[in-house]
């Protein structure tokens, strides 16, 4: 399987699929009301967590959980039956130009967002990377300025498609820049829909 | 909440709701031809308003409203039942470097494309951001240019996600900057389209 | 902004939703397709591996998708470019980026831009260097039209399963 | 193996035009900018300007802007330099180049004279 | 207009002798956000397109001989050939990629002593 996808910025993919999880702890007996029995479906809203960056929301503003699909912190999202998903994700980064001087190369940020699968057949062990984008930021620096920081700059790296989903797989968000993350309403976001 | 989002041009937040509609006219009583009966969707197309900046065509090219959705200049996109909608939005930009000189800060533009509901529940003077997309752009400035413009730059701000919606509320898209919006086909679009 | 804070009552009007059921059939026309990452120079898409599909009548010719019957399809594309370090030799001038999903069908004599993105990066500015653009959309589509993409930096894809691909399913 | 191949030089008249091709092979044409520069007999080098073939996109030294105007077929991987009111001093060899690869094609020769 | 200044504007040399050109651009090359310098050197027989050597100051271009190097950084660039060889006899351009018009030096002819 394709684990490797884009240049990440820790070594241990297993590590780094891990270390990029951070969602919000629900406990899976109490899966969020059911408004459409009939249509497996989720949207969960990027929230921050304290000490991992980046969590998830599952009943604040227009986040919820449809119809048996759950949601822990520890194994990402499961949906509740066999089908042909729709998964999507976006998340909205934002930082500032570090002072003048310094490496330029220290300057450039490439901001990568990922979806992953694991559980089921692929094992607890084996996150496979089904979806991801990617954003090289490089703020422009103003020469002059040898102290302070730059203006803030903002992008979005989003996506999404279709998979195949069976019951007990499990899917997740893993992102390369945790701190840069912007939870500002309507920006960072994760979902999926059963399509058939 | 957060409610900053990115800064804007305006500095009123309801005049700014509704400057950013721009949509075009069109009777409520006559939706498009119904190809689908049983799915509300829509797909609409970015066009140039005189005077607003963004407008949004229903009936040129690949563009459509289906199954009783609605739109108007005024109000936006109506949805003609309660559901869940996977809401999408895309609009592409262009832009000049401005001439050599000056402060890099200066020339920095984050362009914003925000997907809003109002009405319904949420009252006419409530609207609420739903999903939100950002990219700020530097055209990197040739320094020695007094004068004349750098090359074009293009890029483009999408997004989509699902939201459930019922009968009643409206949708529309503000962006931060109308005058910068690329009208190619294909380009700057939105739609909605119900999944449950 | 517009937005302001959820009213109070928010998170119950959500759950006060009548229920609704999608009735699902077994299969609907669905495909997803991933660029083949052993041509280098070009953008083929492929259908039979890495969790690539086709399902319920959409087929693939000549490097496009075969619409299989007539209504609505939500259509999306992604590609995601790349530049190496010190790529660019004599010249600072940007790098043109773009990719556009395109329907040719028996109404237009032409092909017509559906979905489309563009970038100008800087590759001698920043490296290296990563890009995407994604972009999804509904559409309504006719039995025998055809879905197909062009790319402008094919040189700088990456090419991989999760990176660059192409799909469409009816709603 | 990557070409560029200058084309449509010869002898015109003071006053007249010139069309000039640049046909591109063995690399992608799109998306890397097309420089014209001249060069006139026993002189240097002066650049003229630059197109994107992609988007459309062009950049033209002062000296020449309204008289040059730059264009591109990129379903024929060509690019093209149409120069007007041709004066004596516009004889030059005239170069198209790839400068984010580095290729230079040979060159065409126009002579302007009565 | 960034001006370039080339100098000498012609040299004789022997082959096997170490020649140094020298390019000065009216302002900087060096580009603050990555360091680095947007100057080329072209090399030019009669007859003949130039040919890419040197860019970003100092990279030698892909089957470039080695006895070629640049270096320099801000205005003042240096074109060395170490050991002059019977091919090397030809003209050679500096050019400024930092900032619209593209500029060249004049040229600096190299001839057989």
């Known amino acids: 399987q394709d684990q490797g996808g884009l240049v990440t910025e820790t070594a241990d993919p297993g590590a780094q699929a891990q270390q990029g999880l951070g969602f919000q702890k629900l406990p899976e007996e109490e899966p969020e009301t059911d408004l459409s029995p009939g249509l497996p479906a989720a949207h969960l809203i990027g929230a921050p967590l304290k000490g991992q960056g980046l969590g998830w929301e599952t009943t604040k503003e227009q986040a919820f959980l449809t119809s048996g699909t759950q949601f822990s912190d520890a194994e990402g999202l499961a949906l509740p039956q066999d089908g042909l998903y729709y998964l999507y994700c976006l998340v909205g980064y934002r930082g500032r130009a570090p002072p003048g001087g310094g490496d330029p190369q220290g300057r450039s940020v490439t901001l990568r967002s990922s979806l992953y699968r694991a559980g089921g057949a692929y094992g607890p062990g084996t996150p496979e990377l089904l979806l991801e984008g990617a954003e090289t930021v490089t703020p422009v620096l103003d020469p002059a300025r040898r102290q302070g920081y730059g203006p803030l700059w903002y992008t979005s790296v989003g996506f999404g498609g279709l998979v195949q989903l069976r019951r007990g797989e499990r899917v997740y968000v893993n992102i390369s820049h945790p701190d840069m993350v912007d939870f500002a309403r309507g920006k960072t976001f994760f979902g999926a829909v059963m399509v058939g | 909440q957060d409610q900053g989002g990115l800064v804007t041009e305006t500095a009123d937040p309801g005049a700014q709701a509704q400057q950013g509609l721009g949509f075009q006219k069109l009777p409520e009583e006559e939706p498009e031809t119904d190809l689908s009966p049983g799915l509300p969707a829509a797909h609409l197309i970015g066009a140039p308003l005189k005077g607003q900046g963004l407008g949004w065509e229903t009936t040129k090219e690949q563009a459509f409203l289906t199954s009783g959705t609605q739109f108007s200049d005024a109000e936006g996109l109506a949805l003609p039942q309660d559901g869940l909608y996977y809401l999408y939005c895309l609009v592409g930009y262009r832009g000049r470097a401005p001439p050599g000189g000056g402060d890099p800060q200066g020339r920095s533009v984050t362009l914003r494309s925000s997907l809003y509901r109002a009405g319904g529940a949420y009252g006419p003077g409530t609207p609420e951001l739903l999903l939100e997309g950002a990219e700020t752009v530097t055209p990197v400035l040739d320094p020695a240019r007094r004068q004349g413009y750098g090359p074009l730059w293009y890029t483009s701000v999408g997004f989509g996600g699902l939201v459930q919606l019922r009968r009643g509320e409206r949708v529309y898209v503000n962006i931060s900057h109308p005058d910068m919006v690329d009208f190619a086909r294909g380009k700057t679009f939105f739609g909605a389209v119900m999944v449950g | 902004l517009p937005g302001v804070g959820l009213t109070p009552s928010a998170a119950q009007t959500a759950r006060q939703h009548p229920k609704m059921h999608l009735a699902h059939s077994t299969l609907k026309p669905a495909a997803h397709l991933i660029g083949d990452p052993s041509k280098q120079n070009s953008l083929l898409w492929r259908a039979n591996t890495d969790r690539a599909f086709l399902q319920d009548g959409f087929s693939l010719s000549n490097n496009s998708l075969l619409v299989p019957t007539s209504g609505i399809y939500f259509v999306y594309s992604q590609v995601v470019f790349s530049g190496k370090a010190y790529s660019p030799k004599a010249t600072s001038s940007p790098l043109y980026l773009a990719h556009e999903v395109q329907l040719f069908s028996s109404q237009y004599p032409f092909h017509v831009p559906l979905l489309s993105s563009q970038k100008m990066v800087y590759p001698g500015l920043q490296e290296p260097w990563l890009h995407s653009m994604y972009h999804g959309a509904a559409f309504q589509l006719t039995q025998g039209d055809q879905l197909s993409t062009h790319t402008d930096g094919i040189p700088h894809l990456v090419l991989s399963p999760s990176t660059v691909f192409f799909g469409a399913f009816a709603l | 193996e990557v070409q560029l191949v200058e084309s449509g030089g010869g002898l015109v008249q003071p006053g007249g035009s010139l069309r000039l091709s640049c046909a591109a092979s063995?690399?992608?044409?799109?998306?890397?900018?097309i420089e014209w520069v001249r060069q006139a007999p026993g002189k240097g080098l002066e650049w003229v300007g630059e197109?994107?073939?992609?988007?459309?996109?062009?950049i033209y030294n002062e000296k020449f802007k309204g008289r040059a105007t730059f264009s591109a077929d990129n379903s024929k991987n060509t690019a093209y330099l149409q120069m007007n009111s041709l004066r004596a001093e516009d004889t030059a060899v005239y170069y198209c180049?790839?400068?984010?690869?580095?290729?230079w094609g040979q060159g065409t020769l126009v002579t302007v004279s009565s | 207009d960034i001006q370039m200044t080339q100098s000498p504007s012609s040299l004789s040399a022997s082959v096997g002798d170490r020649v140094t050109i020298t390019c000065k651009s009216s302002?900087?090359?060096?580009?603050?956000?990555?360091?680095?310098?947007?100057l080329a050197w072209y090399q030019q027989k009669p007859g003949k397109a130039p040919k890419l050597l040197i860019y970003w100051a100092s990279t030698r271009d892909s089957g470039v001989p080695s006895r070629f190097s640049g270096s320099g950084s801000g205005t003042d660039f240096t074109l060395t050939i170490s050991s002059l060889q019977p091919e090397d006899f030809a003209t050679y351009y500096c050019q400024q990629y930092y900032s619209y018009p593209r500029t060249f030096g004049q040229g600096t002819k190299v001839e057989i002593k």
């Open positions: 302002q900087s090359l060096l580009y603050s956000t990555n360091q680095k310098n947007f």
């Open positions: 197109i994107n073939p992609g988007s459309g996109s062009t």
């Open positions: 180049a790839d400068g984010y690869h580095g290729y």
């Open positions: 063995g690399y992608t044409f799109s998306s890397y900018w």
